[in-house]
Interface confidence: medium
Amino acid sequence: APRGTQAEESPFVGNPGNITGARGLTGTLRCQLQVQGEPPEVHWLRDGQILELADSTQTQVPLGEDEQDDWIVVSQLRITSLQLSDTGQYQCLVFLGHQTFVSQPGYVGLEGLPYFLEEPEDRTVAANTPFNLSCQAQGPPEPVDLLWLQDAVPLATAPGHGPQRSLHVPGLNKTSSFSCEAHNAKGVTTSRTATITVLPQ
C-alpha cells in the first residue's frame, strides 16, 4: 500500500473521543489499535503536531503465544487541569514499518463559567479625584459581558450595557467597594471586591 494512506488497513480500532469541560477538569483520551508483531510506540498529536511532553501511558496485550501474533495496544493521554492551551484536535500516530498511520480525530474543548484575567484592585484615592478600575474575563463560551457594581448596586441596566473592561470613576467622597460580574451562556462569575479608600481632604 502507498505510504501513509488511511485505507482499510489502518490498525486503529478505537479512536479518541471528545472532551468538553470547564477549566481545571481532568480527563483522558484513549486510542486502541491491533497490530501484528512488535507493538509500535503510540504518539499523540494535537492540531497535527506531535506532543513532545505528553502525559500518556501505553498498555500492550498479546493475543497469542508467539511474539509475531497480534497485539492489542492501548494508549491513554491524561489531561490534568484543562486549560485553553489544551484545546484542539487530538489524534494518535504510529509508525509501522515504512508506513505512518493516524487515528480519526477527537476534540478537546473548554466551556464553562467566565474566567477572570484581571480583577479590580484595592486602592487609596484622594477625595473627588478621578480614577479607573479594570476587569477582564473570557470564556469560552464567548461572548462574556461585564456588569460593574458599586457598593453591590449595578451601574448598568444589564450586563454588557455599561462600561466593560475599564470603569472610569469621576471621584468619590467616601470609601466604596467595587466588583464586576462576568456573564456568559454558562452563568455568572463575580470578581473579588475592591475597596477604594478615600483619604479625607
Partner: antibody
Amino acid sequence: QVQLQQPGAELVKPGASVQLSCKASGYTFISFWINWVKQRPGQGLEWMGNIFPGSSSTNYNEKFKSKATLTVDKSSSTAYMQLSSLTSEDSAVYFCARDYYGGSPDYWGQGTTLTVSS
Amino acid sequence: DIVMSQSPSSLAVSAGERVTMSCKSSQSLLNTRTRKNYLAWYQQKPGQSPKLLIYWASTRESGVPDRFTGSGSGTDFTLTISSVQAEDLAVYYCKQSYNLWTFGGGTKLEIK
C-alpha cells in the same frame, strides 16, 4: 485516492490580489497540514507557509508574512492562499502539498502558474 | 530557522556512472522521540511537480528505483544514484521538516 487539485494558470495585473485554490479529496481533510511552495522560473523551491485545516492554525515563512494569507473552507475541503499587492516578482508556480507526519508530504498538487502582467 | 545547504549545485555525468550529492543542515534533524531524521529528497523534472524519492533520510518511497539511496543522520545527508540513467536528468532537492520546512538550493544533474 488522494488528490490535490489546483487551477493550471492565473493571469492578474500588478497591484491586484489573487486567491489560489487547492481542493483536496480522498482523505480526511481536517487532519493533515497543507503547505504552499513557490517556484520562480528556473529557480529553486521556497516554502511559504502551512495551515492545519482542523483548527486553521498557520505558520508562515517570515519572507511571505505580509504577502500571503492562508485559509481553508472545511465544507469544500479546499485550502486557499491569497497573495496581495502583486508584482512581477510574484510570477511563479505555486504548489500545494499535503504534509504527512514523520517528515514528508506524500502528495503534491500540479501547481498553479501565476503570471503578473499589465 | 534551519538552513539547508546542497552541494554541488550542478554536475554532469555519463550514463552508468555513480553519483553522490550532499545536503547539510544547520541543526540536527533527528527527532529523538520518533527516532527519525526528518529529511526528504525530491526529484524535479522540467515542468513537473517535485517527486518524493526518499523520506526519513533513508527510506525509499514506493515505486522509486533501488538505484536511489539516501543515507546520513543528524546534520549530514547524502543521496546516491548507483548507476545514472538518462531519465535521471533533473534537479534534486533536499528538504527538512524537523521544524516547518526548508529546501536546499538544489543539485542539477546533467547527462554527458
